[in-house]
Interface confidence: low
């Protein structure tokens, strides 16, 4: 099959890299500076990708892939590819349409995205506050008083902060 | 392939006046916010102001209320920002910035340009 692709269709030879340039009787080109073909067979080479204003370059186009971006300090990816760049706030606030707001009381946000959340309500699980919540920082839950016998106090620790950048989006 | 190109940046007296120019191409202009962010030195960006499609929603960062005025010309594809009473801290590059279309209303910007020094000195 291959080889009669090959009879049939000169340009299925032309490499990643190259196109197959029917202004030239469908000889294999090398794409232009700036643009890329990722696979064989190509009659075109695509752009590449510019990492402008607030995206910068994480990996160079070459002529047989395509750039990649990320974001400056301050600012995270969002979307497939890094197709957006989303501003960092601090711990303890949210990002809104007038940059970085700290959260209401009653809310906290432990990342520098996302948004702020309510505190546990340690009482829908018959449990108390053992710790009060910030805005950093969720309440910590624990036994309520009467549950706990001399001796034999466990409280629930803190969940341990998740890592920036594998938080759900 | 979509491009904003800023203009009309440079060196001004405090108390002095710009007007930016942001040129887009390549999307269909009149279809979305835009908006005006700013990065001073060593600093973070900042927003600036939006302008919604028709130009009829208009808003502005607190540091700049009063003092500077966003608009839009759909016809030519363009975004504008007036500029008056400039102050040493509105030192920085001005970005223009086209909001997500997936996303609209939010924070998220998917083209910025390339950006055009303001800087404000006696």
């Known amino acids: 099959f291959e080889r009669t692709r090959s009879l049939q269709d000169p340009c299925s030879n032309c490499p990643a890299g190259t196109f197959c340039d029917n202004n030239r009787n469908q000889i294999c080109s090398p794409c232009p500076p700036n643009s890329f073909s990722s696979a064989g067979g190509q009659r075109t080479c695509d752009i590449c990708r510019q990492c402008k204003g607030v995206f910068r370059t994480r990996k160079e186009c070459s002529s047989t892939s395509n750039a990649e971006c990320d974001c400056t300090p301050g600012f995270h990816c969002l979307g497939a590819g890094c197709s957006m760049c989303e501003q960092d706030c601090k711990q303890g606030q949210e990002l809104t349409k007038k940059g970085c707001k700290d959260c209401c009381f009653g809310t906290f946000n432990d990342q520098k995205r996302g948004i702020c959340r309510p505190w546990t309500n340690c009482s829908l699980d018959g449990k108390s506050v053992l710790v009060n919540g910030t805005k950093e920082r969720d309440v910590v839950c624990g036994p309520s008083p009467a549950d706990l016998s001399p001796g034999a106090s466990s409280v629930t620790p803190p969940a341990p902060a998740r890592e920036p950048g594998h938080s759900p989006q | 392939q979509v491009q904003l190109v800023e203009s009309g940046g440079g060196l001004v007296k405090p108390g002095g006046s710009l007007r930016l120019s942001c040129a887009a191409s390549g999307f269909p202009f009149s279809d979305y916010f835009m908006s005006w962010f700013r990065q001073a030195p060593g600093k973070g960006l900042e927003w600036v102001s939006h302008?919604?499609?028709?130009?009829?929603?208009?808003d502005y960062a607190d540091s700049v209320k009063g003092r500077f005025t966003i608009s839009r010309d759909n016809a030519k594809n363009s975004l504008y920002l007036q500029m008056n009473s400039l102050r040493a801290e509105d030192t920085a590059v001005y970005y223009c910035a086209k909001e997500d279309p997936r996303l609209p209303g939010t924070t998220d910007f998917d083209y910025w340009g390339q950006g055009t020094l303001v800087t404000v000195s006696s």
């Open positions: 302008i919604s499609s028709s130009g009829n929603s208009i």
